[in-house]
Structure formats: structure tokens, C-alpha cells
């Protein structure tokens, strides 16, 4: 029972985590304009992995995609790659783990096969989570580096009356979503790996011991009670109870159309 709970919880946690990784990858707010020097700005800039956006005080938002591939920084390409690898591995992991769930019966699948699949999906979730965390961390590091560089150069080129203030960028919401989602996927993967140990069949097979009573020959096999009640780890037993797969509706909230600076 504990194994099923661990496996189920691991699956749900990973599912939430991967949904979060997908959301973070698609989000535009990976980096947002630092408002420290100008908290009441009339033009607010923010950037994602795929496009950069500008939100005016008028409520008008304009987004422009990065239509070049070669002209983009290598670090940004690396972050994109890490996030996509994370999503792909996570999606495959989810697919594998659905079939590995103890509460779902698929033909006459052995518990050993389910254990292997659980372990595989668990490893996939762990790698997926690590990819997401790595991707977000690389981007965050890039932001920190650029932030201090632009701070050092902030008022350079100030000639006479004219001031040129560089736009500085700080951590956007997507980074925090990515870190949390990556962490959840990682935790879910670990839980799946733990569940795998409980699913694996015990190697020790007890041999039947015969007891000869007067005039009767009764064979007693240990584990017989377990087998009849559906408990224990007898691999020959088919699980009669099917808990069914529960699906949850996911609700994603997006910023309002009129999100003013």
C-alpha cells in the first residue's frame, strides 16, 4: 500500500513539476527590467527564451520573437536546449510511469516489469528536473553577470546635458517557476525510484514443506494466506482491485490583458 502511495505521489509531483517546466519555458518573464532607479517607469521591458516584450503604461504590450538562430547568445541557446531536453525527458518519463503505476492494470504485466519502468521513469524525472534547474541557473548567472556589468557602465557616455541610462534586467517570475518545477520533478523522480525498490519482487523462493499427518497428506505452503487476500509480494498473483487512474484538471492563470506598468 505504501509503495502504491509513494509511486502515485511521485507521479503526481512529477506531473506538476513537468507542467511547471513547460510553463516556465513558455513564459516571457525570464528577465524583467530592474526598476530600482525608476520605480514609476512608463515603458517596462521583459524577456523570455523565445521573445522579448515591452509593456507601456498605456496597457499596450508588444512582443517580438527572436527570429534569428545564429545571432543569439550561446548561453541562451544552451538554456533553451536544457529546458527542451528537460521537457522531452519528463514527457517520456510521464508516459512510462503511467504504465508503471501499480494501480493501473495492463494485461498480464509482471511486477518486475513495473518496477523496471518505475525506475526508468524515476531516473528520467531526476534528469529532467536537473536539466530544468541547470537551465534556469545558467540563465540566472547570465543575468547577474550582465546586471553588474551594466551597473558599472550605467552612466557612461554622459556628455553634457544628455544622459544615457542603460536598461538593467533582473530575475523574472519564470526563473522561480523553473526552480520550483525542477525541484518538484526531481523529488517526484526520487519518490519513483524509492517506490521501485518496493515493487521489485523478492528473490527468495520458499520451497514447499510437506507435513505428514496420520492417514492424510496435507501440503502447507507459506504465504498462502497472503496470496489469497491479495497482500504480499507474490508475483504470480494478479491484482483484482483496480483503483483507476485519477486525472486532475490543470488551471493555468495568465496575466490580464491590461496589465499596466
Amino acid at each position: 500500500m505504501a509503495v502504491t502511495a509513494c509511486q502515485g505521489l511521485g507521479f503526481v509531483v512529477s506531473l506538476i513539476g513537468i507542467a511547471g517546466i513547460i510553463a516556465a519555458t513558455c513564459m516571457d518573464q525570464w528577465s524583467t527590467q530592474d526598476l530600482y532607479n525608476n520605480p514609476v517607469t512608463a515603458v517596462f521591458n521583459y524577456q523570455g527564451l523565445w521573445r522579448s516584450c515591452v509593456r507601456e503604461s498605456s496597457g499596450f504590450t508588444e512582443c517580438r520573437g527572436y527570429f534569428t538562430l545564429l545571432g543569439l547568445p550561446a548561453m541562451l541557446q544552451a538554456v533553451r536546449a536544457l529546458m527542451i531536453v528537460g521537457i522531452v525527458l519528463g514527457a517520456i518519463g510521464l508516459l512510462v510511469s503511467i504504465f508503471a503505476l501499480k494501480c493501473i492494470r495492463i494485461g498480464s504485466m509482471e511486477d518486475s516489469a513495473k518496477a523496471n519502468m518505475t525506475l526508468t521513469s524515476g531516473i528520467m524525472f531526476i534528469v529532467s528536473g536537473l536539466c530544468a534547474i541547470a537551465g534556469v541557473s545558467v540563465f540566472a548567472n547570465m543575468l547577474v553577470t550582465n546586471f553588474w556589468m551594466s551597473t558599472a557602465n550605467m552612466y557612461t557616455g554622459m556628455g553634457g546635458m544628455v544622459q544615457t541610462v542603460q536598461t538593467r534586467y533582473t530575475f523574472g517570475a519564470a526563473l522561480f517557476v523553473g526552480w520550483v518545477a525542477g525541484g518538484l520533478t526531481l523529488i517526484g523522480g526520487v519518490m519513483m525510484c524509492i517506490a521501485c525498490r518496493g515493487l521489485a519482487p523478492e528473490e527468495t523462493n520458499y520451497k514447499a514443506v510437506s507435513y505428514h499427518a496420520s492417514g492424510h497428506s496435507v501440503a502447507y505452503k507459506p504465504g498462502g494466506f497472503k496470496a489469497s487476500t491479495g497482500f504480499g509480494s507474490n508475483t504470480k498473483n494478479k491484482k483484482i482491485y483496480d483503483g483507476g487512474a485519477r486525472t486532475e484538471d490543470e488551471v493555468q492563470s495568465y496575466p490580464s490583458k491590461h496589465d499596466y506598468v
Epitope: Q33, A42, Y46, E56, S58, G59
Partner: antibody, heavy 118, light 113 residues
């Protein structure tokens, strides 16, 4: 079409208060910011501030903090400018203007002349 | 605050001739995020409210005749009327839309020579 219709001219004594209204039609008031601009006789335009449509929170230019109050009544699609403790130098035409793409003032009221004289 | 300085204060041009008004800002109005200059031009005729002519430094508002054009980037901007018409007699203002408080130039009075 978008229209901003302001209340009529006002003649006030120093120390009194005045409330200028600006009725919006042809669009939803809560979708666009409302700006207030002052133009003293024979002078240029002075941006007084604006009121955010989603929160109704006003932002005032430095010279207009204190005696000037912006407000919105969405039920009647009207923006208001209230000036307290009127001074002679408040004599001007006050315009309301909608904030639009490019942070521009694309539609203006016809203006309300407020005259402060003893 | 961003200071907007227009030149000249007044300008007299013959009908059909080119009129040029300059506007200089104390800070860069070019937004790096979308490469747009947040500078707007308005026309104000006597006894009327201002009318939007050009935004984003060079984008003409719908309904504005194509003899009006805007140019410039960063801190230096120009409004050009290619062929002056009698109805173009007005005061022209530039406005910063990049940061609060929004500020206007002192205005340029355009007259017919």
C-alpha cells in the same frame, strides 16, 4: 467614436475648490489611463499626472502634488479633477486626455477654463 | 525629469515650402526592448485642444496628412511638414512618453510668411 466631454468653465474665488469632470464615451474607461494636462493662458502644455485604469491609482507630477486630486467613477464613465485651495496661478485651461499606444495622448477633451479671481 | 527643448520658438514659412521643427531631450528616449523612440508630436490650433500627429518618433497617426513626417532617434528629433498648407498654422509640441513625468517641449509657433 471616442469622445471626451468636459464640464463647462468655472469662475472661482481664491481658497475655493473646483471639480472638473470628463465624461468618456465610445470606449471603456477602465481600459485606458486618463491624463490631465494644464495650459495657462498663452503658455505651453504641462502634464499634471494620470490615473491608472485598472487600480484607479493616481500619479501626480511633482508640481501637482497636494492640492490636486484625480478620481474615476466607472459607473458613469467619468474622470474627475478636483483642485482645492485655489490660487490665482491655477487660472488655466484643464484638459483630460486618454493614454494610448506609444504612451501618447490620442484623444483630448475640449478643455475646461478655470478662472481664479477675487 | 526629462527636459524637452524645442527650436525654434517660432517659425515663418511660405505656403508650399518645407517647415522643420526640432526637439531635443535631456535623456535618451530610445527603448532598447523594442527599439522604439518614445517621442510624440502634437499640433494645437488656437482655441482647440492638441491633436496627436506622430508617435514613436516617426509613426503617423491615422488621418494625419502624409506631408507630416517625424524622424530622429535617441535625443534628437525632427518634425517636418514637406509642403506647408494654410491649415497647418498652429503651435507644435513634442512630448516624452518614455518615463514619468511625461514632459512637453515649450512649443513652436508656426506661421505663414
Amino acid at each position: 467614436q471616442v469622445q471626451l466631454v468636459q464640464s463647462g468653465s468655472e469662475l472661482k474665488k481664491p481658497g475655493a475648490s473646483v471639480k472638473v469632470s470628463c465624461k468618456a464615451s465610445g470606449y471603456t474607461l477602465t481600459n485606458y489611463g486618463m491624463n490631465w494636462v494644464r495650459q495657462a493662458p498663452g503658455q505651453g502644455l504641462e502634464w499634471m499626472g494620470w490615473i491608472r485604469p485598472n487600480t484607479g491609482e493616481p500619479t501626480y507630477a511633482e508640481d501637482f502634488k497636494g492640492r490636486f486630486v484625480f478620481s474615476l467613477d466607472t459607473s458613469v464613465s467619468t474622470a474627475y479633477l478636483q483642485i482645492c485651495s485655489l490660487k490665482a496661478e491655477d487660472t488655466a485651461v484643464y484638459y483630460c486626455a486618454r493614454l494610448y499606444r506609444g504612451n501618447t495622448l490620442d484623444n483630448w477633451g475640449q478643455g475646461t477654463l478655470v478662472t481664479v479671481s477675487s | 525629469d526629462i527636459v524637452m527643448t524645442q527650436s525654434p520658438d517660432s517659425l515663418a514659412v511660405s505656403l508650399g515650402e518645407r517647415a522643420t521643427i526640432n526637439c531635443k531631450s535631456s535623456q535618451n528616449l530610445l527603448n532598447s526592448g523594442n527599439q522604439r523612440n518614445y517621442l510624440t508630436w502634437y499640433q494645437q490650433k488656437p482655441g482647440q485642444p492638441p491633436k496627436l500627429l506622430i508617435y514613436w518618433a516617426s509613426t503617423r497617426e491615422s488621418g494625419v496628412p502624409d506631408r507630416f513626417s517625424g524622424s530622429g532617434s535617441g535625443t534628437d528629433f525632427t518634425l517636418t511638414i514637406s509642403s506647408l498648407q494654410a491649415e497647418d498654422v498652429a503651435v507644435y509640441y513634442c512630448q516624452n512618453g518614455y518615463s514619468f513625468p511625461f514632459t512637453f517641449g515649450q512649443g513652436t509657433k508656426l506661421e505663414i510668411k
